[in-house]
Interface confidence: medium
């Protein structure tokens, strides 16, 4: 299975609201181990 930062981030976030590939979460810090690098 994919274990890049991108894929892990998407699994961690659970429900995605994408804006240019950025995971959004208004309540808790969500690691974006890819877009934010």
């Amino acid at each position: 299975s994919c274990n890049t930062a991108t894929c892990v981030t998407h699994r961690l976030a659970g429900l995605l609201s994408r804006s240019g590939g950025v995971v959004k979460d208004n309540f808790v810090p969500t690691n974006v181990g890819s877009e934010a690098f």
């Epitope: 890049t4 930062a5 991108t6 892990v8 961690l12 240019g20 590939g21 950025v22 995971v23 959004k24 979460d25 208004n26 810090p29 969500t30 690691n31 974006v32 181990g33 890819s34 877009e35 934010a36 690098f37």
Partner: antibody, heavy 122, light 107 residues
Framework: EVQLVESGGGLVQPGGSLRLSCAAS????????ISWVRQAPGKGLEWVAE??????????HYAEAVKGRFTISRDNAKNSLYLQMNSLRAEDTAVYYC?????????????WGQGTLVTVSS | EIVLTQSPATLSLSPGERATLSCKAS??????VSWYQQKPGQAPRLLIY???NRYLGIPARFSGSGSGTDFTLTISSLEPEDFAVYYC?????????FGQGTKLEIK
């Protein structure tokens, strides 16, 4: 205010060891992924290693050039990141930066320390 | 390893002119590309993430575009403080990689 302060750089002989530290403040350190990135004098940027958050079991990834020689670790109680560098080579000479990156609310965050210089020379 | 190739290596322009910097990836990286600016003696500064999103506080004259393998950073009208080295990076696959940089110098 987020702050990252690297330390531990210096002059070391080829084959020697050094441990770099990155002291973090201004955020909940344990929640976030963090990397070491280096830059040889007059050269470009090179990613070295990454450690994930406590909730991700602090999983690690390394660049091929340092795999087996460098170890990234974190002490969440001390809000500190480390890079243990063994079997150092001349080509490891660089400024080493710690880099924090995450998404908090609606804005991506990206913070760099000021860097610490490692010189490997006899 | 995904190789990022930046062009040109050096770009000589005058303030007020438009700068166009290119970054080509050896494999598809969707939009997981960032652009950094670095000045001598300073840490890199994130300008663009996700290929086209401006980072916090970055002036509107900086814009990014592209997807797949071809990416562009455009500075619409150069200010004196924009002369620096620019790097693209990809974070789609490990290892994260950077381009070799484009030096933007005053003509």
């Amino acid at each position: 205010e987020v702050q990252l302060v690297e330390s531990g750089g210096g002059l070391v002989q080829p084959g020697g060891s050094l441990r770099l530290s990155c002291a973090a403040s201004g955020f909940t350190f344990s929640n976030y992924w963090i990397s070491w990135v280096r830059q040889a004098p007059g050269k470009g940027l090179e990613w070295v290693a990454e450690i994930r958050s406590e909730s991700d079991a602090s999983a690690t990834h390394y660049a091929e050039a340092v795999k087996g020689r460098f170890t990234i670790s974190r002490d969440n109680a001390k809000n500190s990141l480390y890079l243990q560098m063994n079997s150092l080579r001349a080509e490891d000479t660089a400024v080493y930066y710690c880099l924090l990156y995450f998404d908090y609310g609606l804005a991506i965050q990206n913070y760099w320390g000021q860097g610490t210089l490692v010189t490997v020379s006899s | 390893e995904i190789v990022l190739t930046q062009s040109p290596a050096t770009l000589s322009l005058s303030p007020g002119e438009r700068a166009t910097l290119s970054c080509k990836a050896s494999k598809r990286v969707t939009t997981y590309v960032s652009w950094y600016q670095q000045k001598p003696g300073q840490a890199p500064r994130l300008l663009i993430y996700g290929a086209s999103n401006r980072y916090l506080g970055i002036p509107a004259r900086f814009s990014g575009s592209g997807s797949g393998t071809d990416f562009t950073l455009t500075i619409s009208s150069l200010e004196p403080e924009d002369f620096a080295v620019y790097y693209c990076s990809q974070s789609y696959n490990y290892p994260y990689t950077f381009g070799q940089g484009t030096k933007l110098e005053i003509k």
